[in-house]
């Protein structure tokens, strides 16, 4: 039998995400993060 | 509020065609993921599912009627139209239409029912 | 086509007493999505069907809590903890995974 239309079953789960870079000081290079839901994973 | 009222001719001969019309309120038939489903349960018996129309037009039917079923929809008038050719006194029932909404936003089920309308056919 | 078969087909019950339909496919109806489309309706005398619980086990927004569903495959069964007056009618399963959409035959719940 075929298959009734549905959704994929998966909901996305829309976020902004944010790349930043900061200086931290003369001899630390920079830092570069990854703010998802405005907690740094990277 | 949500509502859907069917109507039909309630009394026609065998081999006529009958034509029925859902008429939706409170909802758009141009929703993204909405849908209009008709059902039949004859009297005293259970229930039984005719056909679905989506949003897209795109359309599903059950293939033991589907050579005598044609479903679709008017969303100017936000109206679904069922027809169902060569009638027969086997197709004496209640007939109703009910919504289902895909995705987020609905439960996809059947979450609101019409009150439905008897066709009695006989010669 | 998948059959759906519902035991018992009638259910005298005690106001107060618990009740259980099961509800049973002759195939499995987990969707290609990895979601299980099973669904119950209750028709009450002189009424439209009306949505209990969908998706085997989410309760329709209203639908007091006395009522339940679960399984998964081909088993399924609807609960109500406490049986009130208001619950009388019939009780029917729905797949809606695969085409066409197909019923139980129904189970009449009275009150004793």
């Known amino acids: 039998d075929a298959e009734f239309r549905h959704d994929s079953g998966y909901e996305v789960h829309h976020q902004k995400l944010v790349f930043f870079a900061e200086d931290v000081g003369s001899n630390k290079g920079a830092i570069i993060g990854l703010m998802v839901g405005g907690v740094v994973i990277a | 509020q949500v509502t859907l009222k069917e109507s039909g001719p309630g009394l026609l001969k065998p081999t006529q065609t009958l034509t029925l019309t859902c008429t939706l309120s409170g909802f758009s038939l141009s929703t993204s993921g909405m849908g209009v489903g008709w059902f039949r349960q004859p009297p005293g018996k259970g229930l039984e599912w005719l056909a679905h129309i989506w949003w897209d037009d795109d359309k599903s039917y059950n293939p033991s009627l589907k050579s005598r079923l044609t479903i679709s929809k008017d969303t100017s008038k936000n109206q679904v139209v069922l027809t169902i050719t060569n009638v027969d006194p086997v197709d004496t029932a209640t007939y109703y239409c009910?919504?289902?909404?895909?995705?987020?936003?609905?439960?996809?089920?059947?979450?609101?029912w019409g009150q439905g309308t008897t066709v009695t056919v006989s010669s | 086509d998948v059959v759906m078969t519902q035991t018992p087909l009638s259910l005298p019950v005690t106001p107060g007493q618990p009740a259980s339909i099961s509800c049973r496919s002759s195939q499995s109806i987990l969707h290609s999505n990895g979601n299980t489309y099973l669904e119950w309706y209750l028709q009450k005398p002189g009424q439209s069907p009306q949505l209990l619980i969908y998706k085997v086990s989410n309760r329709f927004s209203g639908v007091p809590d006395r009522f339940s569903g679960s399984g998964s495959g081909t088993d399924f069964t609807l609960k109500i903890s406490r049986v009130e007056a208001e619950d009388v009618g019939v009780y029917y399963c729905?797949?809606?995974?695969?085409?066409?959409?197909?019923f139980g035959q129904g189970t009449k719940l009275e009150i004793k």
């Open positions: 009910a919504r289902r909404q895909l995705g987020t936003r609905g439960t996809d089920a059947m979450d609101y």
């Open positions: 729905l797949q809606t995974t695969r085409v066409p959409l197909t």
